[in-house]
């Protein structure tokens, strides 16, 4: 698993829709793989995280003032859609085959 | 200024070329403000950090299971270009208008 | 290396037109603007205006705009400044210097003196 | 237009003393951070040589004791050293707008 110590890099995470109460509108699944981006942004960032140029100037900020400016977060920079049954206004069961922006596609350092 | 209990908001940060040792190549300007993103993303997430479906439902899991995943993380979510003067490959001193993405314009939870 | 090599003096009338080629060679001739910059004796500088040999652009200084024209035959990498109507104070040394983009002039011609009289 | 004012016009120093040149513009010459103020150096019969871009930076082979400084309206060329063959007339060029314009430019001559 990604550690502190680790990279920025993608791991699982399993959400359940009762456990953040969402339960109440999303019929199924009951539970998805969101994914999560854990790791750190270490100096030199590599071509993997697809830093921007701010993350590099940050970083390498981050590198003389460790104290006064913090790294680059890991974190999502593309997401996927998942499929979703929900209940419409009416109460009528509808899919729904791209609630966009629910599962981690990349990381990388922002 | 934005500390650790605060909300995720932009905050200075005057980055110095020579700093960095950017210097090397970037003749002018010598420094420019680059801004931070710092902050938390706490629950509930505000409108104006823009969050995606994946940071809200992140926040729900952490507010859930706060030691087994990590909150959102505060970061960039559009960049602003810099104007350099840099030495072309001739020597001569080039004015590059619109070096992209140097330059916080929003912070977000992520 | 980057050389400007411009053509030769000129005595000319009251009235009359010259025009200066400027020959550039060790350096891609688009890549940068050229500008005419003169001098007439015991004086100043004065910026004439600057080219785009890429695109043929021009910027003119707006007291030379109704009787200078500034173009390129990319072809033989020269540049060329005609200054038409002349008068007794067009009497100057005309030099032609490569522009960096943001305007600072780091290579200059040898100079061409163009005397006006009659 | 912006224009450019040097003073003094004519210095006169013996060598090895330090030559401070100074170049006043009538609107401030910085944008995006840059300061578009360059210096020439002229000898008599010669083409003007680019000395300082960019307010402090030397051009490509100029002696270390020609160095720039300034922003916004006022800027200095300082010749730390003089050296006989620093004899010439110096200019100063602003970059930001057309038309481009200069200095009426400072005579530096050798005691």
């Known amino acids: 698993s990604a550690g502190a110590g680790s990279h920025c890099q993608k791991t699982s995470l399993r959400v359940n829709f009762e456990d953040i109460g969402w339960d109440s509108w999303i019929i199924a699944p009951k539970e998805y793989e969101a994914y999560e981006c854990k790791g750190g942004c270490f100096f030199p960032l590599a071509d993997d995280v697809t830093p921007t140029k701010h993350a590099i100037v940050q970083t390498l900020v981050h590198l003389k003032f460790p104290t006064k400016v913090g790294k680059a977060c890991c974190v999502p920079t593309k997401l996927s859609p998942i499929s979703v049954l929900y209940k419409d206004d009416m109460g009528v069961p509808t899919l729904k085959y791209h609630y966009e922006g629910m599962s981690v596609a990349e990381c990388g350092c922002r | 200024s934005a500390g650790a209990g605060s909300h995720c908001q932009k905050t200075s940060l005057r980055v110095n070329f020579e700093d960095i040792g950017w210097d090397s190549w970037i003749i002018a300007p010598k420094e420019y403000e680059a801004y931070e993103c710092k902050g938390g993303c706490f629950f509930p997430l505000a409108d104006d950090v823009t969050p995606t479906k994946h940071a809200i439902v992140q926040t729900l899991v952490h507010l859930k299971f706060p030691t087994k995943v990590g909150k959102a993380c505060c970061v960039p979510t559009k960049l602003s270009p810099i104007s350099v003067l840099y030495k072309d490959d001739m020597g001569v001193p080039t004015l590059k208008y619109h070096y992209e993405g140097m330059s916080v314009a929003e912070c977000g939870c992520r | 290396q980057v050389q400007l090599v411009q053509s030769g003096a000129e005595v000319k009338k009251p009235g009359a037109s010259v025009k200066v080629s400027c020959k550039a060679s060790g350096y891609t001739f688009t890549r940068y603007w050229m500008h005419w910059v003169r001098q007439a004796p015991g004086q100043g500088l004065e910026w004439m205006g600057e080219?785009?040999?890429?695109?043929?652009?021009?910027n003119y200084n707006e007291k030379f705009k109704s009787r200078v024209t500034m173009t390129v035959d990319k072809s033989i990498s020269t540049a060329y400044m005609e200054l038409s109507r002349l008068r007794s104070d067009d009497t100057a040394v005309y030099y032609c210097?490569?522009?960096?983009?943001?305007?600072?002039?780091?290579?200059w011609g040898q100079g061409t003196l163009v005397t006006v009289s009659s | 237009e912006i224009v450019l004012t040097q003073s003094p016009a004519t210095l006169s120093l013996s060598p090895g003393e330090r030559a401070t040149l100074s170049c006043r513009a009538s609107e401030s010459l910085d944008n995006y951070g840059i300061s578009f103020m360059n210096w020439f150096q002229q000898k008599p019969g010669q083409a003007p040589r680019f000395l300082i871009y960019?307010?402090?930076n030397q051009g490509s082979g100029i002696p270390a004791r020609f160095s720039g400084s300034g922003s916004g309206t006022d800027f200095t060329l300082t010749i730390s050293s003089l050296q006989p063959e620093d004899t010439a007339v110096y200019f100063c060029q602003q970059s930001k707008e057309v038309p481009r314009t200069f200095g009426g430019g400072t005579k530096v001559e050798i005691k």
């Open positions: 210097a490569i522009g960096a983009n943001y305007g600072g002039l780091v290579y």
């Open positions: 080219i785009n040999p890429s695109q043929g652009g021009t």
């Open positions: 960019a307010a402090s």
